[in-house]
């Protein structure tokens, strides 16, 4: 779509005559008729295919034509067209004499034509005016013309429609050739795609307006290049969303199970050596002179009653020393100078001679011990209570006072929080020092596996022989689509080798 513009500039008819040679009375009141049509090698009669236009009376005999375009007037003359400009044309301009105000052809005198010009040629779309002058025997017409595109039309033949816009359907202005030129911050064929914040991750980020970076689910950070770990992940990281890859020394679904208690808590005291022995579990190997679960108790070397035969023990800086009773000698008073004749056995112990009477041994009644049955049995010396339980002597027996979370004769049993089966949907219960933890089966989550979540039943690759696996989201089950030559719910059987059924 465009406009052929014709600017009439000057018409000369010095003698004021008509084409017939007859003079106008009193002068030639001149108006113009213009016919624009498709190119014809010889301008022929027929429709003005590109349009026609007439002017009012513009002057008498010879006159210059005023440019009226600024005042919304008729010069230049406008011949609009609504097709692709072909680049060629034929133009006919007729000058007519109008004695009165009625310019209709049938109202004019029979010989009212003053002059007629017909030109044809090529004309490219453009802003520049082509100046032309046509002379006949008695008249001369000076004019210029051009073809320009209508608003929103562009290109060599005004065939490209382009309307600048800045809305949901595009953000662009139009170049002279009709191509789109995107506004800053926009891209794409129709400039509908915003240019995101520089560095915004191509896959994990997006934007709805320029210089924005919105993260897709599972990603975070200014540029959406940081994954979000699994909710509740304590001592872990991720490389893809919802992962929880445990830091060194941590385990469990949420990396909250301490596998390196020694490093994280340094429980062993007094220079003891700590060894990890499982989840939240450790063993302290005490340096000499210390005891207790965490080697927190200073040990007197006399506590182990090293002196025999009633010898009394004295602590020393570099160890201990046994003061032996009469008739005994040696580091631990282990050697006797006595015999059965000396009645060395106390508390009803019976004496047996050895080495032809050179030595003896006492057989002690219950609850007494020592080489001379001189000691009451301390049932706690073997430290029988497990898990840090405290041993108490109670007459002929002993008893363990257990630490919280342990039970049993020797505190060997954990008090189980798991006994009441708190984990739903087949979750596995783990006792912890301060409570319990449920490990949920696929498809469930929550502290007690009470929340049903959608799972990808295909994640475990259950289908054989390159079958395609599809997840049934309504039942969280899978369906295998077998390739040619295989059957079975998992495509595990080759065709022709049916499974052996028991019936």
């Amino acid at each position: 779509s465009g406009v052929f513009q014709l600017q009439l500039q000057e018409f000369i008819n010095e003698r004021g005559v008509l084409a017939s040679g007859r003079p106008c009375e009193p002068g030639c009141r001149t108006f113009f008729r213009v016919c624009l049509k498709h190119f014809q090698a010889v301008v022929s009669p027929g429709p003005c295919t590109f349009g026609t236009v007439s002017t009012p009376v513009l002057g008498t005999n010879s006159f210059a034509v005023r440019d009226d375009s600024s005042g919304g007037g008729r010069n230049p003359l406008q011949l609009p067209f609504n097709f692709t400009w072909p680049g060629t044309f034929s133009l006919i301009i007729e000058a007519w004499h109008a004695p009165g105000d009625d310019l209709r052809p049938e109202a004019l005198p029979p010989d009212a034509l003053i002059s007629k010009i017909a030109i044809q040629g090529s004309l490219a779309v453009g802003q520049n005016w082509l100046l032309d002058e046509q002379t006949s025997t008695l008249t001369r017409l000076r004019y210029s013309y051009r073809v320009i595109c209508s608003d929103n039309y562009y290109g060599d033949n005004c065939s490209r429609l382009c309307k600048k816009r800045n809305d949901h359907f595009g953000h662009y202005v139009c170049q002279p050739d009709g191509n789109l030129s995107c506004l800053p911050g926009w891209t794409g064929e129709y400039c509908q795609q915003p240019i995101c914040l520089s560095g915004c991750h191509e896959q994990n980020g997006y934007c709805s307006k320029p210089a924005e970076c919105l993260c897709r689910p599972g990603w975070q950070g200014r540029l959406c290049n940081e994954c979000i770990p699994h909710n509740g992940c304590r001592h872990g990281t991720c490389s893809t969303p919802w992962q929880c890859t445990c830091d060194e020394g941590w385990g469990g679904l949420f990396c909250d199970q301490d596998l390196n208690y020694c490093t994280h808590h340094s429980p062993c005291k007094n220079g003891a050596t700590c060894s990890n022995s499982g989840q939240r579990s450790y063993t302290c190997t005490c340096r000499p002179g210390y005891t207790g679960v965490d080697c927190e108790l200073e040990l007197s070397e006399c506590d182990s009653n090293p002196c025999r035969n009633g010898g009394s023990c004295k602590d020393q800086e570099d160890g201990y020393h046994c003061l032996c009773p009469p008739g005994y000698y040696g580091l631990h008073c282990e050697h006797s100078t006595l015999s059965c004749a000396d009645s060395p056995c106390f508390n009803g112990g019976s004496c047996r001679e050895r080495n032809q009477g050179a030595n003896y041994a006492c057989e002690c009644p219950p609850n007494f011990t020592g080489s001379n049955c001189e000691k009451k049995v301390d049932r706690c010396t073997s430290n029988p209570c497990a898990n840090g339980g405290q041993c108490l002597n109670r007459g002929p027996s002993r008893m363990c006072r257990c630490r919280p979370g342990f039970t049993g004769t020797y505190c060997e049993l954990h008090v189980s929080d798991c006994a009441r089966n708190p984990c739903a949907h087949g979750g596995t219960c783990h006792d912890l020092e301060n409570g319990l933890m449920c490990t949920c089966p696929a498809g469930f989550s929550g502290r007690r596996c009470e929340v049903r979540t959608s799972i990808d039943a295909c994640a475990s690759s259950p289908c054989f022989n390159r079958a395609t696996c599809y997840t049934d989201l309504s039942t969280d089950t899978f369906v295998c689509n077998c390739p040619y030559g295989f059957v079975g719910s998992r495509c595990e059987f080759p065709v022709g080798l049916p499974p052996s059924f028991p019936w």
Partner: antibody, heavy 119, light 111 residues
Framework: EVQLQQSGPELVKTGASVKISCKAS????????IHWVKQSHGKSLEWIGY????????NYNQKFKGKATFTVDTSSSTAFMQFNSLTSEDSAVYYC????????????WGQGTSVTVSS | DIVLTQSPASLAVSLGQRATISCRAS??????????MKWFQQKPGQPPKLLIY???NQGSGVPARFSGSGSGTDFSLNIHPMEEDDTAMYFC?????????FGGGTKLEIK
Amino acid sequence: EVQLQQSGPELVKTGASVKISCKASGYSFTAYYIHWVKQSHGKSLEWIGYISCYNGATNYNQKFKGKATFTVDTSSSTAFMQFNSLTSEDSAVYYCARDYDYDVGMDYWGQGTSVTVSS
Amino acid sequence: DIVLTQSPASLAVSLGQRATISCRASESVDNYGISFMKWFQQKPGQPPKLLIYAASNQGSGVPARFSGSGSGTDFSLNIHPMEEDDTAMYFCQQSKEVPWTFGGGTKLEIK
């Protein structure tokens, strides 16, 4: 009132020439074109060509090139068609009609001139 | 040359009824949205008279019962209601290309 007045009937010998006239009145002769059309007895119409009454530019049907010649006399507002080397095939009624650049078509016709070619 | 084929060659229509004459061109006679097709009426001993130009526009002084339609290669002239005075030969004519050509004509009579 627009009128196209053609010359009278012609009886001519084979090989001779004939010149038919068409005098226009009631309109600005030079602004228009004059067409010439042949109609053989009981047959359809055949376009011979046209002439611009303003500058004498012509356009002929290839079939009649060399056979027909168009001229105009603007001073008398008359168009002429000369037919050469006549044969019996040229016996027909010949019409003139006016036409204009701002297409209506051949809106006014002459009454026709009958040409009979005899041996 | 563009060949124009008219049908039927002759037609008899009752007074007050509709007469339809067709004209088919051997190639399109349209250019820049205008159909270069005209219709003429010719009565015996008279010159042709312009009825329709540019396929559907009525010539000066032509009664409204004459109407034209079509584009490209297929055109028709309709006369409704048919009157006594409409007995004549009817010709289509194209002016898109030189040489201008006419159809063979259709003879319309009263039934």
